[in-house]
C-alpha cells in the first residue's frame, strides 16, 4: 500500500491522543533506555510503512502483536484516514483471525515495541517531511 | 562486531539475471535493523538498491524497482540480491550494508560483477 | 529525485592542513545528510549522520553541520590516513536515496 495520500496530520492526532498511551502501557515497567532503536523512517508515507509491517508482520520471538490495543487503533486510524487502506488489508485480516488467541508479552515483543514508538516518534517530528 | 560477505558470480551475460547473497556474521539479521544493497560502477559514484528490514518490509530504488528483488534466509544468515535482464550498465561493485532504513554503519568489501557476453 | 552536488570536485592539501568539502542539495533535506569516506579498493565507511553526528569510533578531527540544502564536512588537521574520496547520502526523500558524485582529498 502507498501511504502517500493518507491525511498524517488526522493519523499524527490518532497517536498522540490514544495509540501512543497505549504503547506506553504496553512497555510499562520496561526502561526507556532498555533497548536500543535499530530502525527508522524518513519522511511520513516511509514511517507509516514501516509502523504497518512492524505492527502487523509476524517476526522471530514475536509472532503477533495485531491483537494488541494499539494495534487495533493503528489499523483503524490507517482505515479511517489512508484512502483505499481497508481494501488492500483483507488477506492480512484473515491471517489475524488465525493468530495465537493469546496474548503473551515476551522480551522480544517489548522490544518490537520499543522500535515502534521510536518509527511513531520520527513519523510525529515536525520537519518531517510529508512525501 | 557485524561482518558483512558478498558471493557471487562475477561475469554475468546480458539480459541474464545477477545473482549475489551477503552472508552476516557476529549479528542475527532476524533481530534488528535492516539488510541493503548498494552499487557502484567502476570510477562513479554510490547508487542505493533497496534493503529488506528484519521484520519483512521491503523498499527498492524506484529506477531499479523492476528488476529487483531482495530476500532473506534468516537460517543461514543471509541476504539476497536478484537483478534481471542486466546489461552493461548494471557492471558495478555490489556492496551490501546494514542500514537503519536510513544510512549504511557496516558494509561488506564488495564484489565486483561484470556484465559482459 | 534530489540532487547532490559535492565541491570541490577534488582538494590538494597537505597532511596537518584542514580540508572543508562542501554538499548541496537540490532542494531542502533537513538535517538527514550522511557522510562516508572510501579509500581505494575499500567499502564507503560511514563518519557522520544526521549531518553533525559522528559514528561510532570516528576520530573528532571528523565534524560535519549544516541543514536545509547546504553541509559541511571538516577535517580539522588531516592525516595520512584521511586521504581517500568523500560522498554525501541523503535520506530525506525515501524511496529514493541518493549520493553525492564524491569529492577526492589528495595529498598535494
Known amino acids: 500500500y502507498d501511504f502517500t495520500n493518507c491525511d498524517f496530520e488526522k493519523i499524527k492526532a490518532a497517536y498522540l491522543s490514544t495509540i501512543s498511551k497505549d504503547l506506553i502501557t504496553y512497555m510499562s515497567g520496561t526502561k526507556s533506555t532498555e533497548f536500543n532503536n535499530t530502525v527508522s523512517c524518513s519522511n511520513r508515507p516511509h514511517c507509516l510503512t514501516e509502523i504497518q509491517s512492524l505492527t502487523f508482520n509476524p517476526t522471530a520471538g514475536c509472532a503477533s502483536l495485531a491483537k494488541e490495543m494499539f494495534a487495533m487503533k493503528t489499523k483503524a486510524a490507517l482505515a479511517i484516514w489512508c484512502p483505499g487502506y481497508s481494501e488492500t488489508q483483507i488477506n492480512a485480516t484473515q491471517a489475524m483471525k488465525k493468530a495465537r488467541k493469546s496474548k503473551v508479552t515476551t522480551n522480544k515483543c517489548l522490544e518490537q515495541v520499543s522500535q515502534l514508538q521510536g518509527l511513531w516518534r520520527r513519523f510525529n517530528r515536525p520537519l518531517l517531511k510529508q512525501q | 562486531q557485524v561482518q558483512l560477505q558478498e558471493s557471487g558470480p562475477g561475469l554475468v551475460k546480458p539480459s541474464e539475471t545477477l545473482s549475489l547473497t551477503c552472508t552476516v556474521s557476529g549479528y542475527s539479521i532476524s533481530s534488528g535493523y535492516g539488510w541493503s544493497w548498494i552499487r557502484q560502477p567502476p570510477g562513479k559514484g554510490l547508487e542505493w538498491i533497496g534493503y529488506i528490514s528484519y521484520y519483512g518490509s521491503i523498499s527498492y530504488n524506484p529506477s531499479l524497482k523492476s528488476r529487483v528483488t531482495i530476500s532473506v534466509d534468516t537460517s543461514k544468515n543471509q541476504f539476497s540480491l536478484k537483478l534481471s535482464s542486466v546489461t552493461a550498465a548494471d557492471t558495478a561493485v555490489y556492496y551490501c550494508?546494514?542500514?537503519?532504513?536510513?544510512?549504511?554503519?557496516?558494509w561488506g568489501q564488495g564484489t565486483l560483477v561484470t556484465v559482459s557476453s | 529525485e534530489i540532487v547532490l552536488t559535492q565541491s570541490p570536485a577534488t582538494l590538494s592539501l597537505s597532511p596537518g592542513e584542514r580540508a572543508t568539502l562542501s554538499c548541496r542539495a537540490s532542494?531542502?533535506?533537513?538535517?538527514?545528510l550522511a557522510w562516508y569516506q572510501q579509500k581505494p579498493g575499500q567499502a564507503p565507511r560511514l563518519l557522520i549522520y544526521d549531518a553533525s553526528s559522528r559514528a561510532t569510533g570516528i576520530p573528532a578531527r571528523f565534524s560535519g553541520s549544516g541543514s536545509g540544502t547546504d553541509f559541511t564536512l571538516t577535517i580539522s588537521s588531516l592525516e595520512p590516513e584521511d586521504f581517500a574520496v568523500y560522498y554525501c547520502q541523503q535520506y530525506s526523500d525515501w524511496p529514493q536515496y541518493t549520493f553525492g558524485q564524491g569529492t577526492k582529498v589528495e595529498i598535494k
Open positions: 550494508a546494514r542500514t537503519n532504513l536510513l544510512y549504511f554503519d557496516s
Open positions: 532542494q531542502s533535506v533537513s538535517n538527514n
